[in-house]
């Protein structure tokens, strides 16, 4: 029951996380800037991974997409790649984990197969979450190093004087969404991996055996005891004794013919 709950919760947490990663990737507010030296009106600029927008206090808003691929900063391309890889891995992980859920029966799928699928999806979620966290962190670092140092450096260009605009660069909402979403996906992945341990059949345990003395006809077969090592034929912890001896799992089973003589 705990395994099913852990697996189910891991799936839900990862699902929310991946939805958040997708949302963060699509959002425009990765970086926001205040052009506070502008004498006209409050002008706010905000940029995403795909387009740049300007919003004025008058209500006017305009966005323009980055239509070039080659001319963009390498760091932006790297962040885009990390986020997309995160989404793709997360989506595949979700697909795999749906079939791995203990509460969903698909044909005669073995628990070992479900355990493997749960582990696979868990690893995918972990990598997906790490990709998202890495992407957002790279972008945040780019903002800190490149832009918060932005002062009014003046130099002369061909068409006259050029200066960097004194802007106040701040982390956009998408960064926080990305960090939280990446963290959730990571946590969900860890939960799936934990659930996998509970799903995997124990192959090296020694099952306790209870003996029921139910009369004179109980036949004890010498040499009948075989410890399941995982290498022999008894990998599924099958019942060894014919008589009243049963494994702990079968104590509640129906009475055998030997119980009534």
């Amino acid at each position: 029951m705990a395994v099913t709950a852990c697996q189910g919760l891991g799936f839900v947490v990862s699902l929310i996380g991946i939805a958040g990663i997708i949302a963060a990737t699509c959002m425009d507010q990765w970086s926001t800037q205040d052009l506070y030296n502008n004498p006209v009106t409050a002008v706010f600029n905000y940029q995403g991974l795909w387009r740049s927008c300007v919003r004025e206090s008058s209500g006017f808003t305009e966005c323009r997409g980055y239509f070039t691929l080659l001319g963009l900063p390498a760091m932006l391309q790297a962040v885009r790649a990390l986020m997309i890889v995160g989404i793709v891995l997360g989506a595949i992980g979700l697909l795999v984990s749906i079939f791995a859920l203990k509460c969903i029966r698909i044909g005669s799928m073995e628990d070992s197969a479900k355990a493997n699928m749960t582990l696979t999806s868990g690893i995918m979620f972990i990598v997906s979450g790490l990709c998202a966290i890495a992407g957002v962190s790279v972008f945040a670092n780019m903002l800190v190093t490149n832009f918060w140092m932005s002062t009014a450096n003046m130099y002369t260009g061909m068409g006259g004087m050029v200066q960097t605009v004194q802007t106040r660069y701040t982390f956009g909402a998408a960064l926080f969404v990305g960090w939280v979403a990446g963290g959730l996906t990571l946590i969900g992945g860890v939960m799936m991996c934990i659930a996998c341990r509970g799903l995997a059949p124990e192959e090296t345990n020694y099952k306790a055996v209870s003996y029921h003395a139910s009369g004179h006809s109980v036949a004890y077969k010498p040499g009948g005891f075989k410890a399941s090592t995982g290498f022999g034929s008894n990998t599924k912890n099958k019942k060894i004794y014919d008589g009243g001896a049963r494994t702990e799992d079968e104590v509640q089973s129906y009475p055998s013919k030997h119980d009534y003589v």
Partner: nanobody, 122 residues
């Protein structure tokens, strides 16, 4: 390389009119605010008029009602229509643009033109 080229300056009589234009060219991604500043001999550079992409404008008190700023976002061009010119309007008029480049849309720059001379004299 981005260039701001001003044109339309010259000598005009008091009460006359002039139309300045400034065209920005180069690998521009988006121009935010465009404007006109002026610098009279022996004085500091001062704001004349500015305009945002959304056409919000601001004028210096000394030119309000006489000067009109406009822009064409598609052509990356700003205009300054100057009417009822006075001798005190004599100055070098500089075009200004806050813009970002196609190669780095995350960084904003202020570019200045080299200026056009406006002389109001009888």
């Amino acid at each position: 390389q981005v260039q701001l080229v001003e044109s339309g300056g010259g000598l005009v009589q008091p009460g006359g009119s002039l139309r300045l234009s400034c065209a920005a060219s180069g690998s521009i991604f988006m121009i935010n605010v465009m404007g006109w500043y002026r610098q009279a001999p022996g004085k500091q550079r001062e704001l004349v008029a500015v305009i945002t992409r959304g056409a919000s404008t601001n004028y210096a008190d000394s030119v309000k009602g006489r000067f009109t700023i406009s822009r064409d976002n598609a052509k990356n061009t700003v205009y300054l229509q100057m009417n009822s010119l006075k001798p005190e309007d004599t100055a070098v008029y500089y075009c200004n643009a806050d813009l970002n480049l196609a190669s780095d849309p995350f960084k904003w720059y202020t570019y200045w033109g080299q200026g056009t001379q406006v002389t109001v004299s009888s």
